[in-house]
């Protein structure tokens, strides 16, 4: 029997740590190769609120498996250690909790949205990426445990959240709620009404969660969120009913009440008398068979557009419906129109509508070169949105700090890295994308004439980051382009 | 470390069982004493949501099944099986299943077991069929106390320590599996190319050798669904598990006279949780890998897994760069037409 | 329960100018266009146009452009219609309906303008 | 702009007549047509939306039909209360225009 708060407790977590310490460090070569690798492992099992138990006593039966290795015995006798120790310093926290043996919840697994890509990691004894991972999950998972039982005496007034609200256009979902933390951290959970509750957003100090990949899968659901709040560095303290604080959200119906996006003309062409408008259709994050499905596919006939129609000289406005994505109206030969679209879905009570597409005029260029460059970062925003539910661990060559007499060599780069993206995804709306944003941005860059830049690092040169960096550093410089236009 | 660290640790974290196996905690349910509505049972779920690590590594499950004239309570604990728990010597305690057996207590019908494997004390068996047999039998019924006053009988002794500690083929600890074990269900899983299981027990199956198994059964009245942990070495419904090397479930139709019989195998954890009927599966062996990729010039590249849809990545030799706007990923897909699997070709280009 | 009430009827000289209300209650204002139809006596409904109370947009039969101006108060779920210049055949019930895109489904009780010298 | 012809201009028929208006549109709306009901000094009511949807609360004797450029409105079983005028209106594109009505009188 081991006192955690005493002498036990110092010993278990310093050797735990230092044995931790120890086998990262003879790892530290391990890395290079393991790029964001997402192992079956760590989707099913989380240190999650209340199952910290169940995570560290799973993780220490899988750091056994690594003991035949046919490595150093220093190695060997550290990872038993680490894995031994784990184990019974479990059951002392079990007992400074004031619990039985550590409670571990339902052996439930969580599950995964991405398919098992038969990655049998438990089988693979040079898997040396897994264990690394493994090591940094049970130190932080540890930390997080030990941080909380050194501050159980202090105080533990939390602060309910309140003003939940649920923040959905195109159905990428967000609660958020308010206050901002001091001294305490949140965990959001969601459920349908018949459904289990999930946890989302861990501990954070946000006041804002992406909710997302849990309403997608069922967008005709009725969803229910609650926001819990523990005390900073204490989470396994509870409010005086000894359960931790929380806060119920209104309902939510993705399909009825997430908001219409902004509609976007994707092109119009005039034959005569008649001008065919079509409107693009948006991508959401709504999934099926492994593709992204557009507004269209989700909503079907309840999705109607309204354009407005004028002509360039004049204000009087006109306006036609469709329960497709094209328009075909009559014009005056001659003259040039412009427009501007509204998404409505009619069976609606709140919500109906959109706000107004931008306008579109003929006779000139679709929205000149700016507009063109407005286009390419909600082109580059929609394909973070779409990688998201992805796991593509490309790191791509990005330059962070354009100087703005390489902006155009540096835009070439992200062009070109661009495409690794459309090859790894595999996936038909970010090709699409992809396409149709080098194309606005290729229009842009000629527009400039062929501009020699000398001095400027090859893109093979730049650092190579994550796509999540990629992006941002694209967004600047396409900003940058769009203040010097 | 600190010398007198270093031997606490050395000296008190690890336990050994007789053949110097390094022993490790066991999981039990852990709710104490609860009411309960078990009666006239062949066996009873405990219905106790509480997984717990217990203490000591020595320490076994137990379960403690009580009626008198006002209730029945079921109380569920960890306990080291050297002490005597409610004044009875745990006689039982290496079995695998919790089989109860009843002991003499004034004023009430008391029955008790206890039992090693993970959450064993989640399943109370009062059955007389398994009160009689062999506790090493096959078949997994396992389990049976033999008396001998609380030490194990030597050969008891020697399979619980071979069965404890299994290795696969390269020597790697083997640890029990997590399946689905809902047994059989009723389900509305039809015409679809696969079907969640939608059972909520996750267990840990009692021997590391055992893989996930899903059984799909239609007849004219209704359609039902078997999930549970079994011996591959072992048939199931008469049939071999041919699949159970495989990481999905991928069902396949037998032949069953009077019903419509599908049944898969697995060895991931939860595998039987996802059942796949879909064609594309059936006709290809779930064990496909592929062979070593092509060389990529100036390009090396380290496989950790050569299963189908693993992605992989060559990596630029030094002194080398991966040109920009290509990638460096293969991915292990199936060529349909032959049933063969392949790497793809990369669109790599490494330059100095 | 949703309800439009119009206000009463105006008698008008020519020349004038008449601005009729439309009050929309239970239901979101700016979730539905407002519509305004005429009905000259005896005769059929005649569409003047629409305002959309989300973005302010108005859209006009041509033979009511300059005749009539639609507006909205969004504080107080109102919508208006002022006609100018009024002239004897102007004399009609002018009613507003709420629009769901594919119909009028709620209408107003109708407001009778009558221009007479 | 769409011309909507509606025919016949007045139609006389008894209670538990089956009667058919029809709505031509001068170009393709699709099915974006809706039929209305007026009692004399009433507001208009809405019977028929999406030319074959029947609107909330309206007694299924009533019943829309056709797409493109002809539409019909038909009662299968007239009722005392069924006498008024009934209008069409294409809602496609402003402006969004009725038909100049059919008046159903009791024979």
């Known amino acids: 029997d081991c006192d955690i708060e005493g002498k036990d407790g110092k010993q278990y977590e310093s050797v735990l740590m230092v044995s931790i310490d120890q086998l990262l460090d003879s790892m530290k070569e391990i890395g290079s190769n393991c790029l964001n690798n997402e192992f079956n492992f760590f989707k099913r099992h989380i240190c999650d609120a209340n199952k910290e138990g169940m995570f560290l006593f799973r993780a220490a039966r899988k750091l056994r498996q690594f003991l035949k290795m046919n490595s150093t015995g220093d190695f060997d006798l550290h990872l038993l250690k680490v894995s031994e120790g784990t184990t019974i310093l479990l059951n002392c926290t079990g007992q400074v909790k004031g619990r039985k043996p550590a409670a571990l919840g339902e052996a439930q697994p969580t599950k995964s949205l991405e398919e098992n890509k038969s990655l049998k990691e438990q089988k693979k004894l040079n898997d040396l990426c897994f264990l690394k991972r493994l090591l940094q999950e049970i130190k932080t998972c540890w930390n997080k445990i030990l941080m909380g039982t050194k501050e159980h005496s202090g105080t533990t007034n939390t602060v309910a959240a309140y003003n939940l609200t649920w923040k959905s256009t195109n159905f990428k979902t967000i609660l958020e709620w308010e206050p901002k933390p001091v001294n305490q951290v949140y965990t959001v959970q969601i459920s349908t009404k018949s459904g289990d509750w999930k946890s989302k957003c861990f501990y954070t100090t946000d006041t804002e969660c992406d909710l997302t990949d849990e309403i997608v899968k069922d967008v005709k659901q009725t969803y229910l969120a609650r926001v819990f709040s523990y005390p900073a560095g204490n989470v396994e303290s509870t409010g005086s009913a000894g359960e931790p604080l929380y806060e119920n959200s209104p309902e939510f119906t993705p399909y009825l009440e997430t908001n219409l996006g902004q509609p976007t003309i994707q092109s119009f062409e005039q034959v005569g008398t008649k001008v065919n408008v079509t409107v693009e259709d948006e991508r959401t994050l709504v999934r099926r068979n492994n593709t992204f499905l557009s507004l269209r596919d989700v909503f079907g006939k309840d999705l109607i557009y309204t354009l407005y129609y004028w002509k360039s000289s004049s204000s009087g406005k006109k306006t036609a419906k469709t329960n497709t994505n094209e328009f075909l109206i009559d014009v005056d030969k001659g003259e040039n129109y412009c427009f501007s679209v509204q998404a409505v879905i009619p069976s609606r009570t709140v919500n109906r509508k959109s706000t107004d597409s931008p306008v579109e005029c003929m006779g000139q260029e679709k929205g000149e070169f700016r507009e063109n460059w407005v286009n390419v970062i909600s082109d580059l925003k929609k394909i973070e949105d779409l990688i998201q539910s992805m796991h593509i661990d490309a790191t791509l060559y990005t330059e962070s700090d354009v100087h703005p007499s390489c902006k155009v060599t540096a835009m070439k780069c992200f062009l070109l890295e661009l495409q690794v993206i459309s090859l790894e995804s595999g996936d038909a709306s970010i090709h699409d994308t992809v396409e149709n944003l080098i194309i606005l941005a290729n229009n842009s860059l000629s527009s400039n004439g062929n501009v020699t830049e000398s001095g400027c690092k090859e893109c093979e040169e730049l650092e190579e980051k994550n796509i999540k960096e990629f992006l941002q550093s694209f967004v600047h410089i396409v900003q940058m382009f769009i203040n010097t236009s | 470390i600190p010398p007198h660290v270093q031997k606490s640790v050395n000296n008190d974290m690890i336990v050994t069982d007789n053949n110097g196996a390094v022993k490790f905690p066991q999981l039990c349910k852990f709710c104490d004493v609860r009411f309960s509505t078990c009666d006239n049972q062949k066996s009873c779920m405990s219905n106790c949501s509480i997984t717990s690590i217990c203490e000591k590594p020595q320490e076994v499950c137990v379960a403690v099944w009580r009626k008198n004239d006002e209730n029945i309570t079921l109380e569920t604990v960890c306990h080291d099986p050297k002490l005597p728990y409610h004044d009875f010597i745990l006689e039982d305690a290496a079995s695998p299943k919790c089989i109860m057996k009843e002991k003499k207590k004034p004023g009430e019908t008391f029955f008790m077991c206890s039992c090693s494997s993970d959450e064993c004390n989640d399943n109370i068996i009062f059955s007389e069929e398994y009160n009689t047999s062999n506790p090493d039998g096959g078949g997994g019924s396992g389990g049976g106390g033999s008396g001998g006053g609380g030490s194990i009988p030597p050969h008891v002794q020697k399979s619980v320590n071979n069965d404890m500690i299994v290795t696969d083929n390269n020597g790697a600890v083997k640890f029990p599996q997590l399946c689905k074990f809902c047994d059989v269900r009723f389900s509305t899983c039809d015409n679809q190319k696969s079907c969640m299981s939608n059972c909520s027990i996750t267990s840990i199956c009692e021997k590391p050798q055992e893989v996930c198994v899903a059984v799909w059964r239609k007849n004219d009245e209704n359609i039902t669904l078997e999930t549970v942990c079994h011996d591959p070495k072992l048939p199931y419904h008469d049939f071999i598990l041919e699949d159970a090397a495989s990481p999905k479930c991928i069902m396949k139709e037998k032949k069953k006279p009077g019903e419509t019989f599908f049944m898969c195998s697995c060895s991931s954890d939860e595998c039987n949780d996802n059942i796949i009927f879909s064609e594309e599966y059936n006709t290809s062996n779930p064990d496909i890998t592929c062979p070593p990729p092509m060389s990529v010039e100036h390009a090396d590249i380290w496989v950790k897994s050569y299963s189908l849809y693993s992605r992989e990545r060559y990596i630029c030799n030094s002194g080398f760069k991966r040109k920009a706007g290509t990638s460096s990923l293969t991915e292990c897909v199936l060529n349909k037409a032959t049933n063969v699997a392949h790497w793809t070709t990369p669109s790599l280009k490494c330059i100095r | 329960q949703i309800q439009l009430v119009q206000s009463g009827g105006e008698v008008k000289k020519p020349g004038a100018s008449v601005r009729v209300s439309c009050k929309a209650s239970?239901?979101?204002?700016?979730?539905?266009?407002v519509y305004w139809v005429r009905q000259s006596p005896g005769k059929g409904l005649e569409w003047i146009g629409y305002?959309?109370?989300?973005?302010?947009?108005?859209i006009y039969d041509q033979n009511f452009k300059g005749k009539a101006t639609l507006t909205v108060d969004k504080s107080t779920s109102t919508a208006y219609m002022e006609l100018s210049s009024l002239r004897s055949e102007d004399t009609a019930v002018y009613f507003c309906?709420?629009?769901?895109?594919?119909?009028?489904?709620?209408w107003g009780q109708g407001t009778t303008v009558t221009v007479s010298s | 702009d769409i011309q909507m012809t509606q025919s016949p201009a007045s139609l006389s028929a008894s209670v538990g007549d089956r009667v058919t208006i029809t709505c031509l549109a001068s170009?393709?709306?699709?099915?974006?047509l809706a039929w209305y009901l007026q009692k004399p000094g009433k507001s208009p009511q809405l019977l028929i939306y999406?030319?074959?949807n029947l609107a909330d609360g309206v007694p299924s004797r009533f019943s829309g039909s056709g797409s493109g450029t002809d539409f019909s409105f038909t009662i299968s079983s007239l009722q005392p209360e069924d006498f008024a005028t009934y209008y069409c209106?294409?809602?496609?594109?402003?402006?969004?225009?009725f038909g100049q009505g059919t008046k159903l009188e009791i024979k």
């Open positions: 309906a709420r629009d769901v895109t594919t119909a009028l489904d709620f």
């Open positions: 239970g239901y979101s204002f700016t979730d539905y266009n």
């Open positions: 305002i959309d109370p989300y973005n302010g947009i108005t």
């Open positions: 170009q393709t709306i699709d099915t974006w």
């Open positions: 999406a030319a074959t």
């Open positions: 209106q294409q809602v496609y594109s402003s402006p969004f225009t």
